[in-house]
């Protein structure tokens, strides 16, 4: 049969950050091509990445339709140049992915401190509300729009002259913290979804310190 040298895809893996979602698999194709299908548990299969020699497929457009749904994908293998050929059972070879629920599993991207402003002994630190590819009414939603109060930020802040990191938390994108007058502080933030058991935390934002250009000081 024409599928003698066709091998099924394996190691199907979801790679997803802030809902940008790519399915990856192995092996690199030799004389074969792949097509991916994706479906919700109760929905119909939709084909993507037709007859590709890539070993990844961007499924963001599909999963952002409803990030709380659970998705399943499958990767079909076809002989190169003979995509009509099927396996011995009359079906092309395919492998299923693990199930994937974007809302529960997408990784949280590295946050960014947008600004900080000192007024006397208080500092207001603002975290950038990153835009996602999730849409509602033709507009892209921010991470906060999607997760609401499920998403919190932890602020680590410390005197430039000391090593101990104090923490503050918010379920908005703003912190208001007390600082000692005349001291310079550094800041880093982490996104957290406390209700999760996996992929709970982002990596830390780049550190920003007072005396650098993102900050503003007012008496």
């Amino acid at each position: 049969s024409g599928t003698t040298n066709t091998v099924a895809a394996y190691n199907l893996t979801w790679k997803s950050t802030n809902f940008k979602t790519i399915l990856e698999w192995e092996p690199k194709p030799v004389n074969q091509v792949y097509t991916v299908q994706i479906s919700t548990k109760s929905g119909d299969w939709k084909s993507k990445c037709f007859y590709t020699t890539d070993t990844e497929c961007d499924l963001t457009d599909e999963i952002v339709k409803d990030v709380k749904q659970t998705y399943l994908a499958r990767v079909f293998s076809y002989p190169a140049g003979n995509v009509e050929s099927t396996g011995s059972a009359g079906e092309p070879l395919y492998e299923n992915s693990p199930e994937f629920t974007p809302y529960l599993e997408t990784n949280l991207g590295q946050p960014t401190i947008q600004s900080f402003e000192q007024v006397g002994t208080k500092v207001n630190v603002t975290v950038e509300d990153e835009r996602t590819l999730v849409r509602r009414n033709n507009t892209f939603l921010s991470l906060r729009d999607v997760f609401g109060k499920d998403l919190i930020y932890t602020l680590y802040y410390w005197k430039s002259s000391s090593s101990g990191k104090k923490t503050a938390k918010t379920n908005t994108n703003e912190f208001l913290i007390d600082v000692d007058k005349g001291e310079n502080y550094c800041f880093s933030v982490q996104a957290v979804i406390p209700s999760r058991t996996v992929n709970r935390k982002s990596t830390d934002s780049p550190v920003e310190c007072m005396g650098q250009e993102k900050g503003e000081f007012r008496e």
Epitope: I152, T154, Y156, G164, T167, A168, N171, R200, K201
Partner: antibody
């Protein structure tokens, strides 16, 4: 099942050192914050310090700063409290606790505690 | 550091009594207050978080409330297993601080 188990307590002379361990199971310490809290005999709870194992950040109570060090080994899923220059007033049951890192950050799981006695 | 002033330090009550314990924060801590129960020789157990939310598995006779910087733990009908020491804790800012504790004893 989430569990924290402390070990390493015992009798130590003033000025001595001790290392306590907090072994976690049922969750990954790398995505939580781990605190150490102590309780002197017949007294209330006193916070000692925390570590965020994801970045190594720590903070300590003034009473232990410079003497105690918290660390974590995520491959062993264990946090540690290294206690140096111990004093009689460090005598206490030492607990580790998990911080769920929500906005109010309650300590949702605690270990059973390990007794440290500093005495000559 | 934020001080959490807890009162009373001890109280005597009977089974079925309504018991109220209060904690006052020395400055604003929003709702970042938890309440714990501790029995002799045991680790503390979380009862209430975010000032008024009942932790999973905790009986509904326990409740928490907030009025400004004053926080209250109420046991609506004291049960034999509720005789213990109770602590409030703020974690609005580092370092987190505990109240001095309230020992609930049998009258």
């Amino acid at each position: 099942e989430v569990q924290l188990v402390e070990s390493g307590g015992g009798l130590v002379q003033p000025g001595g050192s001790l290392r306590l361990a907090c072994a976690a199971s049922g969750f990954t310490i790398g995505v939580y914050i781990i605190h150490w809290v102590r309780q002197a005999p017949g007294k209330g709870l006193e916070w000692v310090g925390y570590i965020d194992p994801s970045n190594g950040y720590t903070y300590y109570a003034d009473s232990v700063k410079g003497r105690f060090t918290i660390s974590a080994d995520t491959s062993k899923n264990t946090a540690y409290l290294q206690m140096n220059s111990l004093r009689a007033e460090d005598t206490a049951v030492y607990y580790c606790a998990r911080d769920d890192q929500s906005v109010s950050s309650p300590f949702d799981y605690w270990g059973q505690g390990t007794l440290v006695t500093v005495s000559s | 550091d934020i001080q959490m002033t807890q009162s009373p330090s001890s109280l005597s009550a009977s089974v079925g009594d309504r018991v109220t314990i209060t904690c006052r924060a020395s400055q604003d801590v929003n709702t970042a207050v938890a309440w714990y129960q501790q029995k002799p020789g045991k680790a503390p157990k979380l009862l209430i978080y975010s000032a008024s939310f009942l932790y999973s598995g905790v009986p509904s006779r326990f409740s928490g409330s907030r009025s400004g910087t004053d926080f209250t733990l109420t046991i609506s009908s004291l049960q034999p297993e509720d005789f213990a020491t109770y602590y409030c804790q703020q974690h609005y800012t580092t370092p987190p601080t505990f109240g001095q504790g309230t020992k609930v004893e049998i009258k």
